[in-house]
Interface confidence: medium
């Protein structure tokens, strides 16, 4: 049985052209975890295999740094980066948890608008 | 002045489809995401999921994935949500609502009610 | 996905009164930056849901200082100080931190 549950940084605004750290944790099960899957909509993000470390995917790599842990730290935002993205953890016996998280990129203007909302 | 004009009332047959419209005007449409917000029996809200009109990028609430395809046409500045393989359970009045950074919703449409009956 | 609980479910009131209504959540609203999205709506027969807070605390333009918010984590509350015939109709909280959103099941603020 699937007693795990994923928790994560929870939606969030970022400033275009600055970073951010997506994180997920998973908590409540003894299952190891095997591998960490990071997606945005359809494209595979990384990877972080237990044996094996990680993996960016080449077309992201000047953009995504792996960690710290096993979450992912985005680069050099920009507008189009607003979406949701995804953390699945593959366990053992447990099979597949996965965390959602929704980024919003903002116009630096509009940040400057908003800021009681913006990131440290 | 921001406004959200959607499409009339509906009255559609089981199993057939629908598609309602919302049109902004006032604002950079595609500076913010467009949501959809269903309200059933006068009462209960449910977020049904957003679509992000500067690349197409959709989010889903799960409930929905299936049931409702969220897209926009930035010319004309309207998104739309068409809703599949009705049922009664799928009879609301159904909302667009623009989110603001902070995650709030800061203006919405004025709602567009779906009888799905045969 | 995170549960919004509201209370009351109905809340009979007569002009002038003050009254509370408590929004809470299963977990906590605070993001990992510390941001915490907790917005309020009134919902008035034949309207649209409006905007009141947002930000837990923060009034929507043209909204009366008679509103106000409140609260951190998963506890929150909208008071609302001397009731007027306008302020009748459903009130919403939505917690916009965790995927899906999720609202709570409003509260009918009516006359006594």
């Known amino acids: 049985m699937m007693t795990g549950t994923i928790e994560t940084t929870g939606n969030i605004s970022a400033e275009k052209g600055g970073s951010i750290i997506l994180q997920c944790h998973l908590s409540s099960t003894t299952a190891q975890v095997t591998q960490v899957n990071w997606e945005q909509q359809d494209q595979l993000l990384a990877i972080c295999n237990a044996d094996l470390g990680w993996h960016i995917s080449p077309s992201f790599k000047d953009r995504v740094a792996p960690g710290p842990g096993l979450g992912l730290t985005l680069q050099s935002l920009t507008v189009n980066d607003t979406g949701e993205y995804f953390c699945i953890y593959h366990t053992y016996p447990d099979g597949t948890y996965t965390g959602r998280i929704f980024l919003e990129v903002l116009e630096s203007s509009v940040a400057e608008h908003g800021a009681r909302f913006q990131i440290p | 002045e921001v406004q959200l004009q959607q499409s009339g009332p509906e009255l559609v047959k089981p199993g057939a489809s629908m598609k309602i419209s919302c049109k902004a005007s006032g604002y950079s449409f595609t500076g913010y995401t467009m949501n959809w917000v269903k309200q059933s029996h006068g009462k209960n809200l449910e977020w049904i999921g957003l679509i992000n009109p500067y690349n197409g990028g959709t989010s889903y609430n799960q409930k929905f994935k299936g049931k409702a395809t969220l897209t926009v046409d930035k010319s004309s500045s309207t998104a739309y949500m068409e809703l599949l393989s009705l049922t009664s359970e799928d009879s609301a009045v159904y909302y667009c609502?623009?989110?603001?950074?902070?995650?709030?919703?800061?203006?919405w449409g004025q709602g567009t009610t779906l009888t799905v009956s045969s | 996905d995170v549960v919004v609980t509201q209370t009351p479910l109905s809340l009979p009131v007569s002009f002038g009164d003050q009254v509370s209504i408590s929004c809470r959540s299963s977990q906590s609203l605070a993001n990992s930056y510390g941001n915490t999205y907790l917005s309020w709506y009134l919902h008035k027969p034949g309207q649209s849901p409006q905007l009141l807070i947002y930000g837990i605390s923060n009034r929507f333009s043209g909204v009366p200082d008679r509103f106000s918010g409140s609260g951190s984590g998963t506890d929150f509350t909208l008071k609302i100080s001397t009731i007027k015939p306008e302020d009748l109709g459903m009130y919403y909280c939505?917690?916009?931190?965790?995927?899906?959103?999720?609202f709570g099941a409003g509260t009918k603020l009516e006359l006594k």
């Open positions: 939505l917690q916009g931190t965790h995927q899906p959103l999720t």
């Open positions: 609502a623009r989110r603001n950074y902070g995650y709030y919703f800061d203006y």
